[in-house]
Amino acid sequence: KVFGRCELAAAMKRHGLDNYRGYSLGNWVCAAKFESNFNTQATNRNTDGSTDYGILQINSRWWCNDGRTPGSRNLCNIPCSALLSSDITASVNCAKKIVSDGNGMNAWVAWRNRCKGTDVQAWIRGCRL
């Protein structure tokens, strides 16, 4: 599923991401935009043999199990396929674990490079939330 901007903002808010660990909703929507272009089925294979999955491009070396990444820790205790669902529950729950790991949203390179220090509230402007 490819979410609309406000549709995703609403879904993320329902799942408790607004101000989760101090990150406003706009940060999460911005991260999703530049990680996956709001596409829940986005996958990207990395040259280290790991793969990034879903709307927040969660990595199989650390957070989920895809059965093909050597040394996978699966710290979110989920199959990576769950991160590709149109229901973003699994992605959100795993993202909450990642962001709680000590480095916050810096774990997402796209957020660091494209969202951090910008007017992220623009990503939810005009949305009925």
Partner: nanobody, 117 residues
Framework: QVQLVESGGGLVQAGGSLRLSCAAS?????????IGWFRQAPGKEREFVAA????????TYDDSVKGRFTISRDNAKNTVYLQMNSLKPEDTAVYYC?????????WGQGTQVTVSS
């Protein structure tokens, strides 16, 4: 541009130890990136060995080295280490350091480890 330089390889007897180092230059070592080691034995494909991410000290290892190898990093020195104990002849390979930044990876030139029986 990241440049990675490995050192510490050499010839060692089975059961011995080595510590590999990988120094990064050209870019500040981000504490958020995955940093680790792969290896390639003659005539074989490059295979994952170990990796680490974040200051929380999360690490992961291939089953073949678990309990024998330890990965660590020193962010202040822009260096990642691979402590290799109880080495076996099958650990003989060129060991490569890598840093993953987003969907881009940077690789070193490798250091040869030879374990004799």
């Amino acid at each position: 541009q990241v440049q990675l330089v490995e050192s510490g390889g050499g010839l060692v007897q089975a059961g011995g130890s080595l510590r590999l180092s990988c120094a990064a230059s050209g870019r500040i070592f981000s504490i958020y990136d995955t940093i680790g080691w792969f290896r390639q034995a003659p005539g074989k494909e490059r295979e994952f060995v170990a990796a680490t991410i974040t200051t929380a000290g999360i690490t992961t290892y291939d089953d073949s080295v678990k309990g024998r190898f330890t990965i660590s990093r020193d962010n202040a020195k822009n260096t990642v280490y691979l402590q290799m104990n109880s080495l076996k002849p099958e650990d003989t390979a060129v060991y490569y350091c890598y840093v993953r930044v987003g969907r881009g990876d940077y690789w070193g030139q490798g250091t040869q480890v030879t374990v004799s029986s």
